[in-house]
Interface confidence: low
């Protein structure tokens, strides 16, 4: 670490005195301190001197000598006062700069340590300091204002209490700059625009931040507009809007629209899409398929998109039968809006009842007509069996009748013994029936089909079984030929 | 004083090649679209060329597409027009010209600030 | 791409009122600008937006459009109003700038 003799903190001459402050290191040094006149630098290897014959005010301050070689940076200082009866304060600088909530130093140093007890700081013209102002005092360096705000930006002075009067230093002039976290905000409304032809329309680009120093354009596809800026302030922000109003919107006013905003921190830019349209339009559409098949009991949720132009006049859902009246319930229906254009309309079918089969049909309307979109709704079921013994053309036959959706397959299974259903250990034949006869098949409704197995004798000790399943379960039949009549089973899901 | 200069102008022989400079200053040459228009001697006014004020968008009147190209350079406050393929009928004072794009009640589009034009002949 | 026709010139004794026309299809619905230029001289603007007056020009300009005609009126007419007057609009569907043929104002000595 260098050393400066006279090796004291603090020096204090009168002006006009010969002031010679030597360093020495173990390598070459250097010396700094505040810009002022008179000084002379003598260097000779590992000393350096700096000296004067006319000591000034102005060279108070404080000296450091620092050794450019020393890899721990060591370094020392003395600080010297000038004192002068006429010039208490040394100003260094008449400007300071600094952001929002970060300390300013004033640097207005005393020439004369006896003062220290008489200083304040004071804005110009003697007005008091701002109340809130937070600030201390250091001989050696000035004022310092604490966590300065930007109402603070003010001109200042330095009073110190000289023989009973306060004496001023000159002006500095304090700006606190405010923090920019980043570029404007902005905002473009709307987000999406429609409009007919010949209609009026408005679209607002506006910007904010906490600095005045920013631009703002709002550009259609690669056209800068030249717009009326509005230009305000609150809430500690300032405000620039662009509001584009046309009042009869053609083709050419369609496209992308993207609001620009700058400052030094960067650029923010968002854009929206305006579509000019011949006349009002009413687009129904469903991701989901309109035929719908659905268990018995279980629930659904019927959904439709809309896009329209002017917005819905009317809405609703509607139930087309074939099976009651019933319509469905409001509370069941709910729409949700994506955004101004486009919505979702969803209809929620609980636990659905065998008469809530059939179509269901949403109509929408507005100034450009009414849309329906119909749903086709179909419930499935597991099949139930039923068989009975008959003659047919004068031959034994068991008839078997399943009835289900979708249509059921049939089995039938013959084995030993009586059983209310066979398994495979008792199976002594079986018998696929490929085509079923279809008794009926109406829209909405289950399918029934019948298959005919004819048997010349019934064997007493054995049991004719129909199977019947589909995608939804399997339902059976076991006919046991006593007097008593036929087990049945009831169908599995 | 805001001021467009002009300059590159000269005489060529049909099917040669030019290329003219337009300097601004004195305004924000990056707020404006800007044009090149053309006047042949004794005859009325030709608009020529624009480009949007970021270089985006370019467009040309039916007699040079193809032939010419519109370009900027933001940076240097210029804008530039090369003309290849010269004909006879190209001959024309042309002048470059700051082009104001307003949306205010109805989109338009007019040219504001005019150079002084620089004169092209094209001659065998 | 629709033209605009204006009278190759129009003759006005200094002090009264000269009006130039601009005539083209439906222009009403476009916005009409006027420029001045006197010889060897640029263009300059006088007239945009149909009716606004650059700074600098005198209120003596004025402008109007409906229907299929736009009209420069200068009133008050001077002596150094003398010059060739153009109309122009701007072509949505090319997106080109379009020029009236232009009118010789002659101010009467």
């Known amino acids: 670490i260098p050393v400066i003799e006279p090796s004291v903190p603090e020096l204090v001459v009168k002006p006009g005195a010969t002031v010679t402050l030597r360093c020495v290191g173990n390598g070459s040094v250097e010396w700094d301190g505040p810009p002022s006149p008179h000084w002379t630098l003598y260097s000779d290897g590992s000393s350096s001197i700096l000296s004067t014959n006319n000591a000034t005010f102005q060279n108070t301050g404080t000296y450091r000598c620092t050794e450019p070689g020393d890899p721990l940076g060591g370094s020392a200082a003395i600080h010297l006062y000038v004192k002068d009866p006429a010039r208490p304060w040394n100003v260094l600088a008449q400007e300071v700069v600094v952001f929002e909530d970060q300390d300013a130093l004033l640097p207005c140093l005393l020439t004369d340590p006896v003062l220290e007890a008489g200083v304040s700081l004071v804005r110009v013209r003697g007005r008091p300091l701002m109340r809130h102002t937070n600030y201390s005092f250091s001989p050696w360096h000035g004022f310092t204002i604490h966590r300065a705000k930007f109402i603070q930006s003010q001109d200042y002075q330095c009073s110190a209490l000289m023989g009973g009067r306060k004496v001023m230093s000159i002006s500095i002039r304090l700006k606190v700059q405010k923090v920019i976290p980043g570029p404007p905000a902005l905002t473009l409304v709307p987000a999406e625009l429609v409009r007919i032809r010949g209609e009026a329309a408005q679209i607002v680009c506006s910007a904010s931040s906490v600095d005045v120093n920013f631009d703002v354009f709002l550009q259609h596809n690669n056209t800068k507009l030249a717009i009326p800026q509005q230009s305000d302030f609150h809430n500690n922000r300032y405000q620039k809007v662009l509001t584009l109003n046309l009042d009869q919107v053609d083709f050419q006013h369609a496209g992308n629209y993207s609001c620009v905003a700058s400052n030094v921190q960067g650029k923010h830019s968002t854009s929206m899409f305006f579509r000019v349209v011949e006349s009002a339009y009413l687009n129904l559409s469903s991701e989901q398929n309109l035929i719908q098949e659905v268990t018995v009991g279980e629930g659904l949720n019927l959904k439709v998109m809309v896009e329209a132009y002017p917005g819905l006049q009317g809405f609703n859902w509607t139930y087309l039968g074939p099976f009651s009246d019933h319509q469905p319930e409001p509370k069941l229906a709910n729409a949700t809006t994506k955004d101004t254009y486009r919505h979702t309309f969803t209809l929620s079918l609980p636990r659905l009842k065998p008469s809530e089969a059939g179509r269901y049909s949403f109509l929408a309307r507005n100034p450009g007509g009414w849309r329906a979109l119909t749903f086709e709704l179909t419930l499935r079921y597991p099949p139930e069996v039923s068989v009975i013994w008959t003659f047919i053309n004068g031959s034994g036959t068991l008839l078997c009748a399943a009835s289900g959706y979708p249509q059921p397959n049939v089995t039938w299974l013959q084995c030993s013994g009586h059983t209310d259903r066979c398994d495979e250990a008792q199976v002594l034949q079986v018998w696929d029936d490929p085509y079923p006869e279809v008794l009926s098949q109406e829209p909405f409704h289950k399918v029934t089909v019948q298959s005919l197995l004819t048997v010349e004798t019934l064997e007493h000790n054995q049991t004719y079984e129909c199977r019947a399943h589909n995608s939804v379960g399997s339902g059976s039949w076991a006919f046991i030929p006593i007097s008593a009549g036929a087990h049945t089973h009831p169908p599995d899901e | 004083q805001v001021q467009l200069v002009e300059s590159g102008g000269g005489l060529v022989r049909p099917g040669g090649s030019l290329r003219l400079s337009c300097a601004a200053s004195?305004?924000?040459?990056?707020?404006?679209?800007m044009s090149w228009v053309r006047q042949a001697p004794g005859k009325g006014l030709e608009w020529v060329s624009a480009i949007s004020w970021n270089g985006g968008s370019t467009n040309y009147a039916d007699s040079v597409k193809g032939r010419f190209t519109i370009s900027r350079d933001n940076a240097k406050n210029s804008l530039y027009l090369q003309m290849n393929s010269l004909r006879a009928e190209d001959t024309a004072l042309y002048y470059c010209?700051?082009?104001?794009?307003?949306?205010?009640?109805?989109?338009?589009?007019?040219?504001?600030?005019w150079g002084q034009g620089t004169l092209v002949t094209v001659s065998s | 791409q629709a033209g605009l026709t204006q009278p190759p010139s129009v003759s006005v004794a200094p002090g009264q009122t000269a009006r130039i026309t601009c005539g083209g299809n439906?222009?009403?619905?476009?916005?009409v600008h006027w420029y001045q230029q006197k010889p060897g001289q640029a263009p300059v603007l006088v007239v945009y937006?149909?009716?606004d007056r650059p700074s600098g020009i005198p209120e003596r300009f004025s402008g109007s459009n409906s229907g299929n005609t736009a009209t420069l009126t200068i009133s008050r007419v001077e002596a150094g109003d003398e010059a060739d007057y153009y109309c122009q609009v701007w072509d949505i569907s090319s997106d080109h700038v379009v020029f009236g043929g232009g009118t010789q104002l002659t101010v009467l000595r």
């Open positions: 004195e305004f924000t040459f990056d707020d404006y679209a």
């Open positions: 439906n222009i009403g619905s476009k916005s």
């Open positions: 010209a700051s082009t104001v794009e307003v949306a205010h009640r109805r989109l338009y589009k007019y040219l504001e600030v």
């Open positions: 937006g149909d009716s």
